[in-house]
Structures are given as structure tokens and as C-alpha cells.
């Protein structure tokens, strides 16, 4: 029986050009984590294999950094990075646990963004 739960950073926002850390944490299970895959929609960004370590997709190697821990750091964010991200924990003997994070990349800085909506 799968007893574990995944906690994630949930819905997060970041500034264009900046960076963000995507974090998931698997708890309430003694299952062994054999691999964690990070995906954006159906595109594989990175793999952290318990035996062989981190592997970053060649398509993202300039903008994705491993860690901290089993998390993933996205750099040089663009508006196109807005969307759903999934951490997929492959475990034994439980099976697969999936966490979801929604990232919104804001076009303008927080200051500009705030100024645009200030009450006259």
C-alpha cells in the first residue's frame, strides 16, 4: 500500500530573467527512492538517480542546475517557462509518487508590477 505523500512548493511565481528552486519532499513512507524525474508537461528536464547521480537534459543544460537536494533550479527564466512542473519519485516497493508545481514567470519586476496596479 502506498502511504507516502509528496509536499511541494505549490504555486510559485518568479521574475523573468531570474531563477527559481523547484522543491518536492516525499514523506510518510519508508520506501527507497530509486530515482526522481523532473518534467515540464511531457518534457523530461532532469533525472536524479540514486546510484548514478544527476543527469540534465541536453536541451536544458544551460538553464537547469541540479539541487539543492532532490530539487531543481531553473535559471534565466522566460515567460515561456510558465506552466506545470512535476517531480516524479520512483520508489521501491511503493511505486511512483508525483508532485505538481505551477510556476508563473512574471514579465516585469515586482516594483513595476506593483506600480501598474497602484490606486491613484
Amino acid at each position: 500500500m502506498m502511504t507516502g505523500t509528496i509536499e511541494t512548493t505549490g504555486n510559485i511565481s518568479a521574475e523573468k530573467g531570474g531563477s527559481i528552486i523547484l522543491q518536492c519532499h516525499l514523506s510518510s513512507t519508508t520506501a527507497q527512492v530509486t530515482q526522481v524525474n523532473w518534467e515540464q508537461q511531457d518534457q523530461l528536464l532532469a533525472i536524479c538517480n540514486a546510484d548514478l547521480g544527476w543527469h540534465i537534459s541536453p536541451s536544458f543544460k544551460d538553464r537547469v542546475a541540479p539541487g539543492p537536494g532532490l530539487g531543481l533550479t531553473l535559471q534565466s527564466l522566460t515567460v515561456n517557462d510558465t506552466g506545470e512542473y512535476f517531480c516524479i519519485y520512483h520508489t521501491y516497493p511503493d511505486g511512483t509518487y508525483t508532485g505538481r508545481i505551477f510556476l508563473e514567470v512574471l514579465e516585469s519586476s515586482v516594483a513595476e508590477h506593483g506600480a501598474r496596479f497602484q490606486i491613484p
Epitope: 524525474n37 533525472i47 546510484d51 548514478l52 541536453p58 543544460k61 520512483h90
Partner: antibody, heavy 121, light 108 residues
């Protein structure tokens, strides 16, 4: 050209060990994973494990953990697979195959010719 | 582990006809799927990787499609040398990398 050449056929008794070699040539040996896959007579393909020839890191299928050891000798561009406590069900052709670059993942694009291991009393 | 299921187990086709082989993964493997051909007494040979990219030297009559959990290998016009066993394999989660049980393409 890129190739993997394996050692010759072996006949072993139950309980013994076997060590199969796989010599790589024609490419940068440390840059690509090497996998081991076996095939029992008339059966399908079964993945045994993988080794990173650069770092020596390994990952084994749970079924073989404790019985299989994969090593490499970078000076001769050779990978070894040792299987211990042999039983009759281990009778199979054992293949080494080159996987993706060690920085990412990939299919098995180059295969050795296979080594027949027969376990019989 | 990810279970790969191939169908049919055996496919009887006449030379010149089209053959369609299916492979299903128990969970998404994105496009990290390969197809191999194996003839009796020989090592497997890589045909398709990335679900749809032909390996070096593979004729254009072989094509792969699909993504996620459903994949297809199509041989547009079977030649005599194409009668063999075909395996699919996922290479995104290990251990273990997993193969399908194979589809034998035989002469009708």
C-alpha cells in the same frame, strides 16, 4: 569503427561464478554508459545493470543485486560483468551494449556479439 | 518498475505488406523509447530511439511514433530481411531499464 567485443563461451557448474569481459573500441570509452543484458534460450531480453566507465558507478536490477558485480578497466577500455552463485536458470547469452552519454540517457546503440554461459552439473 | 507490454506476440505478414507493432508502457516514458530488431543467433540491433528517430543506417521503411504510454513501430513494406523479433524498451527509469516481451514478425 565503434564496436564491443566480448569474451568466449563459458560452461560453469551450479554455485560457481562467471566473469565476462567486453572490450570497447572506436569511441571515447569513459563517455558512454555500458549496460549488460541477458537472454535465456527462447526468451526475451532482460536488463541486468549499468556501469559508468568514467566513475565506476553502477546500478543493478534488483533481481541481481548481491550476485552481480560490474567493473571496468579504463586502461584497456574493458568492462567486466561477474555473476556468482550460478544456477541453471542463469544459462543465457549475455550481451554488453553501449548506452547514452554519461551526462544523459540513451538507447543501446552498439551491442557486443554475446557470450553464451551454460550452467550445468 | 515500468512494465512494457507488446502486442501482438506474433504477427503474420506477407512480403510487401505493412506491419504495425504496438508497445504500451505502464506509466509515461515521455519519448524515451527505443525499438530493436533481433534475428536468430544475432545480437539485437537498434532501429528507433527517442520514439521516432531512426538509428544510423536504418532504412526509411521503418518508422516509430507515439509518446507517453502508447507507441507504434511501422514497417511500411516488409522485405525478406525484416522477418525477426522486435523489442521495445524504455530508458528513462532505472533500475531496471525494461524491455517488452517482443513481437515476432513471421512470413504469412
Amino acid at each position: 569503427q565503434v564496436q564491443l567485443v566480448q569474451s568466449g563461451a563459458e560452461v560453469k557448474k551450479p554455485g560457481a561464478s562467471v566473469k565476462v569481459s567486453c572490450k570497447a573500441s572506436g569511441y571515447t570509452f569513459p563517455a558512454y554508459y555500458i549496460h549488460w543484458v541477458r537472454q535465456a534460450p527462447g526468451q526475451g531480453l532482460e536488463w541486468m545493470g549499468i556501469i559508468n566507465p568514467s566513475l565506476g558507478l553502477t546500478s543493478y536490477a534488483r533481481k541481481f543485486q548481491g550476485r552481480v558485480t560490474m567493473t571496468r578497466d579504463t586502461s584497456t577500455s574493458t568492462v567486466y560483468m561477474e555473476l556468482s552463485s550460478l544456477r541453471s536458470e542463469d544459462t543465457a547469452v549475455y550481451y554488453c551494449a553501449r548506452g547514452g552519454r554519461t551526462t544523459w540517457i540513451g538507447a543501446l546503440d552498439i551491442w557486443g556479439q554475446g557470450t553464451m554461459v551454460t550452467v550445468s552439473s | 518498475e515500468i512494465v512494457m507490454t507488446q502486442s501482438p506476440a506474433t504477427l503474420s505478414v506477407s512480403p510487401g505488406e505493412r506491419a504495425t507493432l504496438s508497445c504500451r508502457a505502464s506509466q509515461s516514458v515521455s519519448s524515451n523509447l527505443a525499438w530493436y530488431q533481433q534475428k536468430p543467433g544475432q545480437a539485437p540491433r537498434l532501429l528507433i530511439y527517442g520514439a521516432s528517430t531512426r538509428a544510423t543506417g536504418i532504412p526509411a521503411r521503418f518508422s516509430g511514433s507515439g509518446s507517453g504510454t502508447e507507441f507504434t513501430l511501422t514497417i511500411s513494406s516488409l522485405q525478406s530481411e525484416d522477418f525477426a523479433v522486435y523489442y521495445c524498451q524504455q530508458y528513462v527509469v532505472w533500475p531496471p531499464l525494461t524491455f517488452g516481451g517482443g513481437t515476432k514478425v513471421e512470413i504469412k
